[in-house]
Interface confidence: medium
Amino acid sequence: LIIGFGISGKHFITVTTFTSAGNIGEDGTLSCTFEPDIKLNGIVIQWLKEGIKGLVHEFKEGKDDLSQQHEMFRGRTAVFADQVVVGNASLRLKNVQLTDAGTYTCYIRTSKGKGNANLEYKTGAFSMPEINVDYNASSESLRCEAPRWFPQPTVAWASQVDQGANFSEVSNTSFELNSENVTMKVVSVLYNVTINNTYSCMIENDIAKATGDIKVTDSEVKRRSQLQLLNSG
């Protein structure tokens, strides 16, 4: 969370941004809020990126002004136009690329004053894992798969019954490059699993951490998965 202040004469406004992460290939949002101003025509929003000459996006007088927009952002940016008056200056970014990572500045000017705040935008790939029982294996095993990760993550297994156990000797993890030659599919197999136990497959890189849980009993298989972005907010 980054809060910036600006001074215009005696007036300053608070601008707030959140460190966030973009999932490459998907659309992302760079979050920025400011003190609302009901006079839409008096609001100017400028998004800038460190090291880039030209603007990422400009919104003023109630509409986009892309006359100074840098080439790498052409057709890829939008503000939530109907939410500007309530103080939302967040930027939508189409088809996030690795090169979109960096430091962005959200600059705001309203009839109340002006202010700005920086935002650190990380890019990579992250996805939910899914664990299944691998019945084809010679011994009972679990297969944990996640379709898209970058940079290459670490994978670890845990068990509710054998807490603190190291499963690296009884698991095998592979990384398969996806067709776009950047992201990778993560596959990890855990061997010699026992029934009536809950196992967790944890995948983590510097952007995100994902966990898949599976509970295997005589009568049922229950799954749960979650994804958490790191160092955001």
Epitope: G25, E26, D27, K63, D64, E71, R74, G75, R76, A78, V79, F80, A81, D82, Q83, R92, K94, N95, S127, M128, P147, R148
Partner: antibody, heavy 123, light 107 residues
């Protein structure tokens, strides 16, 4: 009301290049929209081929990327598709379409379509 | 790429009845899902975007729901002009992908 009209040869020889043009009327190709090509083999489902913005920025389907080129001609308010090294598997109805972007909303769904043109790959 | 799976492949319903079509994504697409109607010899027609927002001019009998990986298109009271093929499409991740379609036929 935006209208899109595909044009180009209906028959292409195997290993040749498929070339289609989409004329946009009732709106400017220099708007904030992306312009797409989508195809549909006879009796089958839809496949996005690629998209272009008026600045020339493009996104191509990875499965076709090595064979596809999409270009834009702002002076004629049209955009074009070239697909090289075609085979019978490229026989399809080819549609041009506009994405549904409006300021503050999302990209990627198609709100206007051409009527489609059937391209057959055969010798 | 994200695989979209529609079910059933064919749905037989009587006019005036409710039709429920399903679409499942191989991974989360958030709410970035559209539904299209296609009649023979015609281009697809946008019905729903954002998983639940009706496109301009689409009757209220069409409604969409869901988010993440599970989506539903419901037609509350089928009219004769509603019998067609319906496609879902995700636009959360490039390349945008479509389901294989559900054919809605008269029972």
């Amino acid at each position: 009301q935006v209208q899109l009209q595909e044009s180009g040869p209906g028959l292409v020889k195997p290993s040749g290049t498929l070339s289609l043009t989409c004329a946009v009327s009732g709106g400017s190709i220099s708007s904030s929209n992306w312009w797409s090509w989508v195809r549909q083999p006879p009796g089958k489902g839809l496949e996005a081929i690629g998209e272009i913005y008026h600045s020339g920025n493009t996104n191509y389907n990875p499965s076709l990327k090595s064979r596809v080129t999409i270009s834009v001609d702002k002076s004629k308010n049209q955009f074009s598709l070239k697909l090289s090294s075609v085979t019978a598997a490229d026989t399809a109805i080819y549609y041009c379409a506009r994405d549904g972007y409006s300021s503050g909303w999302y990209w990627g769904y198609f709100d206007y379509w051409g009527q489609g043109t059937l391209v057959t790959v055969s010798s | 790429e994200i695989v979209m799976t529609q079910s059933p492949a064919t749905l037989s319903v009587s006019p005036g009845e409710r039709a429920t079509l399903s679409c499942r994504a191989s991974q989360s697409v958030n709410s970035n899902l559209a539904w299209y109607q296609q009649k023979p010899g015609q281009a697809p027609w946008l019905l729903i975007y954002g998983a639940s927002t009706r496109a301009t001019g689409i009757p209220a009998r069409f409604s969409g729901s869901g988010s993440g990986t599970e989506f539903t298109l419901t037609i509350s009271s089928l009219q004769s002009e509603d019998f067609a093929v319906y496609y879902c499409q995700q636009y959360n991740h490039w390349p945008y992908t479509f389901g294989q379609g559900t054919k809605l036929e008269i029972k």
